[in-house]
């Protein structure tokens, strides 16, 4: 598939009707992050998709109770992840299924990079790269 295909909704227009922000988040492990989707229309529920890497196929994001929360207020949908972990790394997409047409619209994605060094070896490697 062409790389641009990954950012198109089924109608073919890139990221139409949904604006996702920010495009990139880098935070240390344990922090709380929020990502937002702004929609032209509030007529449809928003769900969130996730994939680890750009080439992989997305999956429905299952919200971990007490750690992940989604909220929707008219034209704004927000995903909040508390206490981020390395396994949360990946690209998050909001998706809206319109009530009246059943069309699906998708945001362009927010890449989450969880920072931090889990081992001394990784820290040494980072220092070597800096040098």
């Amino acid at each position: 598939a062409r790389s641009e295909d990954r950012y198109r909704n089924p109608k073919g227009s890139a990221c139409s009707r949904i604006w996702q922000s920010p495009r990139f988040i880098a935070r240390k492990r344990g922090f709380t992050v929020k990502m937002h989707c702004y929609m032209n229309s509030a007529s449809g529920n928003v769900s969130w998709l996730w994939k680890q890497e750009m080439d992989e196929n997305p999956q429905q994001l299952k919200l971990e109770k007490g750690r992940m929360e989604e909220s929707q207020n008219e034209s704004l949908a927000t995903l909040t992840i508390q206490g981020i972990r390395f396994e949360d790394n990946g690209i998050y997409f909001c998706q809206q299924k319109c009530n009246n047409t059943s069309e699906v619209y998708q945001g362009c994605g927010t890449e989450l990079r969880v920072m931090g060094f889990s081992t001394l070896a990784q820290l040494k490697q980072r220092n070597t790269l800096k040098d």
């Epitope: 992989e56 999956q59 396994e87």
Partner: antibody, heavy 123, light 108 residues
């Protein structure tokens, strides 16, 4: 019609090789990750391997890693499984499947299986 | 490697409720899916994303999930529901698909 059709199953000796094919029709093949799943006689379903829509990323069960290779030709709407160093325990019906838990690039998804092709590894 | 654990068999009388469980450490973070598999046939998806029922699947099939356990419930089981049932999901990376060992449902 949306369908998957497998072929290539056969009787092969231990240590031998075989290539399975799965031809897809009725949907935009390149948008979807695809999988091979097998069922040995009298046993349960076992996921064998998966591949992303572009073919750039592949995944394998530990039981076949290093022996099996999954690939796809999106211009031919075809999925492949190259099986080398076959063992008796690889004897199974092999299914090509689009599993709903991997969505397409557009966030849509559906569940679709082929009819299966039998691979028998025996001397 | 990651595993999903199911009971090997469940038996109920027609009209009774059958419950089939599936446990796995990643299930708080990953959705469970359920297949019905009859001999000689391709699997049929009966539940996706823990509790959603595909169109064409009878209402007596339902799913739920709590913590590390997912459950498939067949309310008012019928003779035609006799089959093997498999839960499946992914590991925490999302990249490796894992099937449970399967549960043989007998409707006596």
């Amino acid at each position: 019609e949306v369908q998957l059709v497998e072929s290539g199953g056969d009787l092969v000796q231990p240590g031998g090789s075989l290539r399975l094919s799965c031809e897809a029709s009725g949907f935009t093949f390149s948008n979807y990750g695809m999988n091979w799943v097998r069922q040995a006689p009298g046993k349960g379903l076992e996921w064998v391997s998966g591949i992303s829509g572009s073919g750039g990323t592949t995944y394998y069960a530990d039981s076949v890693k290093g022996r099996f290779t999954i690939s796809r030709d999106n211009s031919k709407n075809t999925l492949y499984l190259q099986m080398n160093s076959l063992r008796a325990e690889d004897t199974a019906v092999y299914y090509c499947a689009n599993l709903l838990l991997w969505l397409g690039y557009h966030g849509d998804g559906f569940d679709l299986w082929g009819q299966g092709t039998m691979v028998t590894v025996s001397s | 490697s990651y595993e999903l654990t199911q009971p090997p068999s469940v038996s109920v009388s027609p009209g009774q409720t059958a419950r089939i469980t599936c446990s796995g450490d990643a299930l708080p973070k990953k959705y469970a899916y359920w297949y019905q598999k009859k001999s000689g046939q391709a699997p049929v998806l009966v539940i996706h994303e823990d509790s959603k029922r595909p169109s064409g699947i009878p209402e007596r099939f339902s799913g739920s999930s709590s913590g590390t356990m997912a459950t498939l419930t067949i309310s008012g089981a019928q003779v035609e529901d006799e089959a093997d049932y498999y839960c499946f999901s992914t590991d925490r990376s999302g990249n490796h698909v894992v099937f449970g060992g399967g549960t043989k449902l007998t409707v006596l």
